[in-house]
């Protein structure tokens, strides 16, 4: 690794902007939208829109703020105590196993399947069973066995895809 | 650059200084860290001096190790060496990279035994 | 004290394979999370910090992911040289957690 001192090679504190605020730690910690320095003696504020702390803490910097992804909308943005509020574009949802990506929303229930609950940001159309009322599992059917939420139009293999 | 040296036979209970020696970068601008390897076993962390001079030490360390610095060199005072800190001794250079910081830079070790 | 957890202990693989090492730390470490390389004899090589991001002449085959306490190395197209002990390690991000080290993973390339 090259010994040349870059700018972002420095330690927070040496490279924080004089605006930024200092305040003395309390018990050790620093309030929400601080970090500590390295000695332990002040808080630094983190960086609006770059950087928050949501709660009190002895980290070294703040934390980074989070970019929405394309696919996503940005419901709230990042501010010193709070990280931004990314949610997945209509027609797509994010599911708890997968959460790095959004993905579109199946258009319709398998066969002999009923929808019972929309496609919303944070799941899938939710089918369950005409006779017994179980909730199917989710996984993508085979295209002749699609009925989509539109009745006479064909299944596309498109609006499969997840 | 750095480089560690110091490391010698010691009888337990006798104090030993090792020394990291840094050229090419100011020690007013890095943290330095120090890390042993016991033979055949891996990497143990000790403690931490930051840019300004504040050490820090791993819970297990506490008391055992005392950590300081001059313009160039940064020393690990070993207190009352036992043969369980048999081991190469490194020091690192700790870089800041925006959000973390991480030992980019390290010395070639130096060998500290421990027996009686 | 936090503990990182690494896992497997070993691993073996052949050349152009993949393989995976996982890494648990005992709290929350947010994304302060590095990847060393240690061949015999030699110093400890950082690979990734940062959870993710590639230390310097690092080739793009080492990769990095997770956040939080659930970590993972990945080396892919496996070479001869890539034959070594790998290491995680909690980076220094507060001032009063340790910056433990995992065990250890030994990667042999068959």
């Known amino acids: 690794e090259s010994a040349l001192i870059t700018q972002q090679d420095l330690a927070p504190q040496q490279r924080a902007a004089p605006q930024q605020k200092r305040s003395s730690p309390s018990e050790g910690l620093c309030p929400p939208g601080h970090h500590i320095s390295e000695d332990g003696r002040d808080c630094i504020s983190c960086k609006y829109g770059q950087d928050y702390s949501t709660h009190w803490n002895d980290l070294l910097f703040c934390l980074r703020c989070t970019r929405c992804d394309s696919g996503e909308v940005e419901l709230s943005p990042c501010t010193t105590t709070r990280n931004t509020v990314c949610q997945c574009e209509e027609g797509t949802f994010r599911e708890e196993d997968s959460p790095e990506m959004c993905r579109k929303c199946r258009t319709g229930c398998p066969r002999g399947m009923v929808k019972v609950g929309d496609c919303t940001p944070w799941s899938d159309i939710e089918c369950v069973h005409k006779e017994s009322g179980t909730k199917h599992s989710g996984e993508v059917p085979a295209v002749e066995e699609t009925v989509t939420s539109s009745p006479g139009t064909p299944a596309s293999p498109c609006s499969l895809s997840g | 650059s750095v480089e560690e040296s110091g490391g010698r036979l010691v009888t337990p209970g006798t104090p030993l200084t090792l020394t990291c020696t840094v050229s090419?970068?100011?020690?007013?601008?890095?943290?330095m860290s120090w890390v042993r390897q016991a033979p055949g076993k891996g990497l143990e962390w000790i403690g931490i001096?930051?840019?300004?001079?504040t050490t820090y030490y791993a819970s297990w360390a506490k008391g055992r190790f005392t950590i300081s610095k001059t313009s160039t060199t940064v020393d690990l005072k070993v207190t009352s060496p036992t043969t369980e800190d048999t081991a190469t001794y490194f020091c690192?250079?700790?870089?800041?990279?925006?959000?973390?910081?991480?030992?980019?830079?390290w010395g070639p070790g130096t060998l500290v035994t421990v027996s009686s | 004290a936090l503990v990182m957890t690494q896992t497997p202990s070993s691993v073996s693989a052949a050349v152009g394979g993949t393989v995976t090492i996982n890494c648990q730390a005992s709290?929350?470490?947010?994304?302060?999370l590095a990847w060393f390389q240690q061949k015999p004899g030699q110093p400890p090589k950082l690979l990734i910090y940062?959870?993710?991001k590639l230390a310097s002449g690092v080739p793009s085959r080492f990769s990095g992911s997770g956040s939080g306490t659930e970590f993972t190395l990945t080396i892919s197209d496996l070479e001869c040289d890539d034959a070594a002990t790998y290491y995680c390690q909690s980076s220094w991000h507060s001032i009063s957690t340790d910056c433990a080290f995992g065990g250890g993973t030994e990667v042999v390339v068959k």
């Open positions: 940062e959870t993710s």
């Open positions: 690192a250079r700790e870089t800041y990279y925006g959000y973390s910081y991480a030992a980019g830079l």
């Open positions: 090419g970068f100011s020690l007013s601008n890095y943290a």
């Open positions: 001096i930051s840019s300004s001079g």
């Open positions: 709290q929350n470490i947010y994304s302060n």
